[in-house]
Amino acid sequence: ELCDDDPPEIPHATFKAMAYKEGTMLNCECKRGFRRIKSGSLYMLCTGNSSHSSWDNQCQCTSSATRNTTKQVTPQPEEQKERKTTEMQSPMQPVDQASLPGHCREPPPWENEATERIYHFVVGQMVYYQCVQGYRALHRGPAESVCKMTHGKTRWTQPQLICTGEMETSQFPGEEKPQASPEGRPESETSCLVTTTDFQIQTEMAATMETSIFTTEYQ
């Protein structure tokens, strides 16, 4: 199941996943001036078995000549629940996290990838929080949030973290202090009702969708 909401927001903090549970989807987004190839994948999908997980489908971007602007994707008034993206992060992961069974590590960048990544998390995903640069962490408990299924609905647990305005930054588990570049903004994306078996994306698409037929019926 995909998580219905974004992980909680903590003032002056960002979060990220150290590894991605099987079923996690990553949008194939391209930077300005480029677009997904028409026969290419819409998403990458973390798949695998208990011993090995990897990202299915490759994202491919192609030049779009005169195109130099991005689309205006504006939510309607009733969709005010803000969805967040994450800036592209280094594929380097702490070994103990990325090697978790049933999890994928951060996918490597693809050529002409967008500067932000849009993930669709699944139930059981854990994200870790840290205070942004210039703020210090006051921990009351774990600085993490997990997407859980309760009574048929998904929810994220509340991370026990307060960030106060001091110059020392706290770190994600297993990470060195950041060098020059700041951490990414909060990530993620969502919605509902998915099983990974539904998601046999583009490998067969070129062959099968060419003959795809839509039929409509009046009920």
Epitope: L42, K71, I201
Partner: antibody, heavy 113, light 107 residues
Framework: PGSSVKVSCKAS????????ISWVRQAPGQGLEWMGG????????NYAQKFQGRVTITADKSTSTAYMELSSLRSDDTAVYYC???????????????????WGQGTLVTVSS | DIQMTQSPSTLSASVGDRVTITCRAS??????LAWYQQKPGKAPKLLIY???SLESGVPSRFSGSGSGTEFTLTISSLQPDDFATYYC?????????FGQGTKVEIK
């Protein structure tokens, strides 16, 4: 007039769940009008402002079928209703706008008193 | 919503003619534009996407050009099968919108 209609759209020959399915209507002798769409794998539907509150788009992944229900029907809702595949991904809860590369044959809905 | 205006509304031409249809957007849509062909009683068929990319299986006599607010669909040598109505569609903004259509009829 005043009643509802539910039109179905069954996809065959390819992957259904991960692609956006949009509904586009065409009144007799008129142009094309986008009503809204859904990506079945996410279950989240987006609607054109004009139809907000009157249209409900759903999808059943198990049968590769999308549905469009239009309520409070008026005579000017008489039209051919098409479903079409579009290549938008889900971005911040909204289906990224795209073009339509596969179309259903259309269903004529006539609203008369 | 972004308004799309096509011209002309009707175009009379003969087989072999070079035909040009124009589509104007009420604001810049970069190259996020598609062209469709529709015949009576049939669903629209995608011809061109991203303003100038030819859809697979569409004859090369169809071509698209333009960016920003002004776009053109050109049929280099009109064939009997090309008499139909043509629509442009923008997908720059959330609410995709179509032009009112251009009917290409036999002169």
């Amino acid at each position: 007039p005043g009643s509802s209609v539910k039109v179905s759209c069954k996809a065959s020959g390819g992957t259904f769940s991960s692609y956006a399915i949009s509904w586009v209507r065409q009144a007799p002798g008129q142009g094309l009008e986008w009503m809204g769409g859904i990506i079945p794998i996410f279950g989240t539907a987006n609607y054109a402002q004009k139809f907000q509150g009157r249209v409900t788009i759903t999808a059943d992944k198990s049968t590769s079928t999308a549905y469009m229900e239009l309520s409070s029907l008026r005579s000017d809702d008489t039209a051919v209703y098409y479903c079409a595949r579009d290549l938008g991904t889900m971005v911040r809860g909204v289906i990224e706008p795209y073009y339509f590369d596969y179309w259903g044959q259309g269903t004529l809905v006539t609203v008369s008193s | 919503d972004i308004q799309m205006t096509q011209s002309p509304s009707t175009l009379s031409a003969s087989v072999g003619d070079r035909v040009t249809i124009t589509c104007r957007a009420s604001q810049s849509i970069s190259s996020w534009l598609a062209w469709y062909q529709q015949k009576p009683g049939k669903a629209p068929k995608l011809l061109i996407y991203d303003a100038f990319s030819l859809e697979s299986g569409v004859p090369s006599r169809f071509s698209g050009s333009g960016s920003g607010t002004e776009f053109t669909l050109t049929i280099s040598s009109l064939q009997p099968d090309d008499f139909a109505t043509y629509y442009c569609q923008q997908y720059n903004s959330y609410s995709r919108t179509f032009g009112q259509g251009t009917k290409v009829e036999i002169k």
